[in-house]
């Protein structure tokens, strides 16, 4: 049993090392954003025992604009592209450690994860408070406005290709 690509988080990317059950992965915030104190970048692949379907727990991560950083706009393709940031203290919870990801729950359903349709892109996640789709103006790998810039990187033992069609890539780009 494996998980589909994890849901998108606004202003964050994710590189999935393993889609296996109980794998734990971390999102990272885009340049110019920082993790809001008290939120967690962790997500875990868990099993919904009621449906016997694996899914990722919903991360509490919020990537917020960091006023201490000079946020550069996406640069046009060029010979050399550099996006640097200025020093700033890390955003940590009062305990000084990042809170753990929300506990796996057997009653979590696909409604809290990305809906995957074979041969399609990763569907946008919904805002818990409004039910509306969160939109980010960040540039995607394809140079088009995207839902977020979250992408999944699958860790493989070597550079050999995985069997085709095992997992959707999980781009959160919407066109």
């Amino acid at each position: 049993i494996t998980c589909p690509p994890p849901m998108s988080v606004e202003h964050a990317d994710i590189w999935v090392k393993s889609y296996s059950l109980y794998s734990r992965e971390r999102y990272i915030c885009n340049s110019g954003f920082k993790r809001k104190a008290g939120t967690s970048s962790l997500t875990e692949c868990v099993l919904n025992k009621a449906t016997n379907v694996a899914h990722w727990t919903t991360p509490s991560l919020k990537c917020i604009r960091d006023p201490a950083l000079v946020h550069q706009r996406p640069a046009p393709p060029s010979t050399v592209t550099t996006a640097g940031v200025t020093p700033q203290p890390e955003s940590l919870s009062p305990s000084g450690k990042e809170p753990a990801a929300s506990s796996p729950s057997s009653n979590n359903t696909a409604a809290t994860t990305a809906a995957i349709v074979p041969g399609s892109q990763l569907m946008p996640s919904k805002s818990p408070s409004t039910g509306t789709t969160e939109i980010s103006s960040h540039e995607s790998s394809h140079g088009t406005p995207s839902q977020t810039t979250a992408k999944n990187w699958e860790l493989t033992a070597s550079a050999s290709h995985q069997p085709p069609g095992v997992y959707p890539q999980g781009h959160s780009d919407t066109t």
Epitope: W15, G143, K151, Q162
Partner: nanobody, 121 residues
Framework: EVQLVESGGGLVQAGGSLRLSCAAS????????MAWFRQAPGKERDTVAS????????SYTDSVQGRFTISRDNAKNTVYLQMNSLKPEDTAVYYC??????????????WGQGTQVTVSS
Amino acid sequence: EVQLVESGGGLVQAGGSLRLSCAASGRTFSSLDMAWFRQAPGKERDTVASINSSGGTTSYTDSVQGRFTISRDNAKNTVYLQMNSLKPEDTAVYYCAARVPSAVSATPIYWGQGTQVTVSS
């Protein structure tokens, strides 16, 4: 098939700087998303920074924000990781990674062989 070769690792004192380079071959470099990962002894391989194929979006893990900068030179088929204000906890093997962006299917991550970075106190 994508081949990646890292360089620039070494021993440096805390507070110092290093610049890692990763040369890619085997595919059009400008079509690749690139990233740097690191793995400390006994720990998992973690994402450090990433840059998309156009160079328009970069991301950093919390602990390196403001200290590390990822960049790419498409003319030289090379991605860089400028590491400033290094700390002992940055000690790890650093891996270059590449991926062909795909919206519909899984694509493998291509890995370099890694380069050791050791920060002494």
